[in-house]
C-alpha cells in the first residue's frame, strides 16, 4: 500500500532548506515539512512569529 506521502527521491535530498522532504503521492511532487521556527514552500524563511 502506497501512503499519501513518503520519502522523497534521492535527487531531492537538499530540496528543503530547514525541513524534511516528503513526496506527495496524490499530487506527484515533493513538499517540505518545516522544522520548528521555519516557514515557506521550501522552509527557507525563519518564522518571525515563532
Amino acid at each position: 500500500v502506497v501512503s499519501h506521502f513518503n520519502d522523497c527521491p534521492d535527487s531531492h535530498t537538499q530540496f528543503c532548506f530547514h525541513g524534511t522532504c516528503r513526496f506527495l503521492v496524490q499530487e506527484d511532487k515533493p513538499a517540505c515539512v518545516c522544522h520548528s521556527g521555519y516557514v515557506g514552500a521550501r522552509c527557507e524563511h525563519a518564522d518571525l512569529l515563532a
Epitope: P9, D10, Q14, V25
Partner: antibody
C-alpha cells in the same frame, strides 16, 4: 505556470550563447529548473538542473564542461549558457520545471553555422 | 547512468485500433518509498513535449483516458486505445529516479 524562452539564435562556431527562460505565475525559487537538448530529428537529452534559490546545479556528465546554468530570482528567469559552440550544439533547447516536467517552455532553436 | 531503451523507432497504427509502446530501463525505477519513477511524454510535430503519464501508471491532468501506463521495475508499456489522428507524434519515456535523468530514444506513432 508559463515558461517563456528567448528567441532563435544563429551563432558562429567557437562562440558562446546565453538562452533565457522566464516564468510567469510561478516563483522559480520554489522548484528546480531543468534544461533539455533536442538535436534536429533526434531525441531528448537532460542537460541539468539549477536550484534558483541558491544556485546549486547538477549537470549530466556530457554537458559538465559545455553548459552553465544560472538564475536571477529578481526577474524570475533561468539562463543556460553554452560555450565553444560546434555544429553538434545545433539544437532546440527547452526549459522545464516542477517534478515530472509538467511545464515546458516553447524551446529555443540554436543554429551553429559559419 | 540509467539507460532507457525504446526498441521500436516507430509503430504504424490504424485509427480506432489500439497500440502499445514499450520502454526498458537498465536499472529498476522502483524507489524504496514504493513509487516507480517512470514518466511518459508525447511530442507532437513542432511542439514541446507534453506529460502523459506520471509514476508509471498515473494519468496526467487533461490527458484522455484512452492512454494508460503499466509495467514493472524495469519494463514499461504505454497503451493507447482507440487511436486518433491527434495522437501522432513521438513518445518518450523518462526515468525520474536519479541524476542524470535520462530519456528513451523515442517511438514515433504513425497513422497507416
Amino acid at each position: 505556470v508559463q515558461l517563456q524562452q528567448s528567441g532563435a539564435e544563429l551563432v558562429r562556431p567557437g562562440a558562446s550563447v546565453k538562452l533565457s527562460c522566464t516564468a510567469s505565475d510561478f516563483n522559480i525559487k520554489d522548484d528546480y529548473m531543468h534544461w533539455m537538448k533536442q538535436r534536429p530529428e533526434q531525441g531528448l537529452e537532460w542537460i541539468g538542473r539549477i536550484d534558483p534559490a541558491n544556485g546549486n546545479t547538477k549537470y549530466a556528465p556530457k554537458f559538465q564542461d559545455k553548459a552553465t546554468m544560472t538564475a536571477d530570482t529578481s526577474s524570475n528567469t533561468a539562463y543556460l549558457q553554452f560555450s565553444s559552440l560546434t555544429s553538434e550544439d545545433t539544437a532546440v533547447y527547452y526549459c522545464a520545471t516542477s517534478w515530472g516536467f509538467p511545464y515546458w517552455g516553447q524551446g529555443t532553436l540554436v543554429t551553429v553555422s559559419a | 547512468d540509467i539507460v532507457m531503451t525504446q526498441a521500436a523507432p516507430s509503430v504504424p497504427v490504424t485509427p480506432g485500433e489500439s497500440v502499445s509502446i514499450s520502454c526498458r530501463s537498465s536499472k529498476s525505477l522502483l524507489h524504496r518509498n514504493g513509487n516507480t519513477y517512470l514518466y511518459w511524454f508525447l511530442q507532437r510535430p513542432g511542439q514541446s513535449p507534453q506529460l502523459l503519464i506520471y509514476r508509471m501508471s498515473n494519468l496526467a491532468s487533461g490527458v484522455p483516458d484512452r492512454f494508460s501506463g503499466s509495467g514493472s521495475g524495469t519494463a514499461f508499456t504505454l497503451r493507447i486505445s482507440r487511436v486518433e489522428a491527434e495522437d501522432v507524434g513521438v513518445y518518450y519515456c523518462l526515468q525520474h529516479l536519479e541524476y542524470p535523468y535520462t530519456f528513451g530514444s523515442g517511438t514515433k506513432l504513425e497513422i497507416k
